[in-house]
Interface confidence: low
């Protein structure tokens, strides 16, 4: 009822001391080679002169980090990246980075890469609001970081920030002009 030589599984390595004979009920645990991760049970058991169990090692490495337009990779380049390895990007001038500067190899897949955007980020005319208007003459194009202010028509009250700012090509949230409650 004893078991003889250990079974071999692709990319799996038996742990502990190797023996010629294993007693019934004895268990042997396997670990995976570099770049591989155990999928399911990691051990085999000797039952009636046969080994039961099938440790499976899955390739969790990544290749070819995502290409980011107008960016280059600044961390060391590898032909294969183990799960958990990070790759760092830098934007070419004059582009600005939005999102995480690093991607990570996560069980065979890369996390989302950043974007390198043109930092000009201009805005169009400010959004119109009900019962209110901007205090300056509206332009067709606004430079990044420029601000405009709103004012409400007579008898309406302003709720929120009266000033909005152009950031990354978008205006911040405009205020509302509410009709005051009349008692």
């Amino acid at each position: 009822t004893d078991c003889l030589s250990l079974p071999s599984f692709e990319n799996a390595i038996p742990m502990g001391e190797k023996k010629d004979v294993y007693k019934a009920g004895e268990q042997v645990t396997y670990t995976c080679a570099t770049y591989y991760k155990m999928d399911g049970a990691s051990n085999v058991t000797c039952i009636n002169s046969r080994w039961t169990g099938r440790p499976t090692c899955r390739d969790t490495s990544c290749v070819n980090p995502p290409t980011v337009q107008n960016a280059y990779i600044v961390s060391r380049q590898m032909s294969k990246y183990p799960s958990g390895e990070r790759v760092r990007y830098q934007c070419r001038s004059p582009y600005e980075m939005f999102g995480d500067e690093e991607v990570m190899c996560l069980n065979g897949n890369w996390t989302e890469p950043p974007q390198c955007k043109d930092s000009t980020g201009k805005c169009g005319p400010p959004p119109p609001i009900d019962n209110g208007d901007i205090t300056s003459f509206p332009l067709s194009v606004y430079a990044p970081a420029s601000s405009v202010e709103y004012q409400c028509q007579n008898l309406y009250q302003l709720e929120g920030n009266k000033r909005i700012t152009c950031r990354n090509g978008q205006w911040s949230e405009p205020p509302k002009c509410l009709h005051p409650c009349v008692i």
Epitope: M97, T111, E112
Partner: antibody, heavy 112, light 106 residues
Amino acid sequence: QVQLQQSGPGLVQPSQSLSITCTVSDFSLARYGVHWIRQSPGKGLEWLGVIWSGGTADYNAAFISRLNINKDNSKSQVFFKMNSLQANDTAIYYCARNFGNYAVDYWGQGTS
Amino acid sequence: QIVLSQSPTFLSASPGEKVTVTCRASSSVKYMHWYQQKPGASPKPWIFATSNLASGVPARFSGSGSGTSYSLTISRVEAEDAATYYCQQWSIIPPTFGNGTKLELK
């Protein structure tokens, strides 16, 4: 081990500002982004914004006009400031470390 | 913004039972994350990018899904699993969270 320690007032008057400092240890702000998330019984978990490792910030459009996030890498500190607070801003505010885009692994203890 | 609807809101299960929490998105998303939160504590990462268990999470947990429908499954629920579970999408800014599913053990 990785930690994010928050410090800031527990009580803010209406129309005043909330300022919270998040001091991190065991990792560098030059390598990891830090998110700000709040939690309230009425609205649940809400993502407010993030400051990335490179220093650029992304904000939730609903808060962009009254929220500012910046940091000092050398002091391992991230600074959060929200203006014009109202009663419906009552919540627990958390800073949390970025893990891949927009997911977080380690959280601060929260500021009520 | 993308709205995430979790169901059920409340779940009562006996130890050893199989439990599934569903998260539906108002538009298609690329991945879903899951967090566990216990009373008085900060949320903890539980499952990253749909199916990757965070460090220290027991193998009885699993995540799956695509498009607008995602789920978190516990194959045999244990007492320590009692908590609130939140899903989170990050395909479109702003990242949004589900309303939470509170799991109670009988």
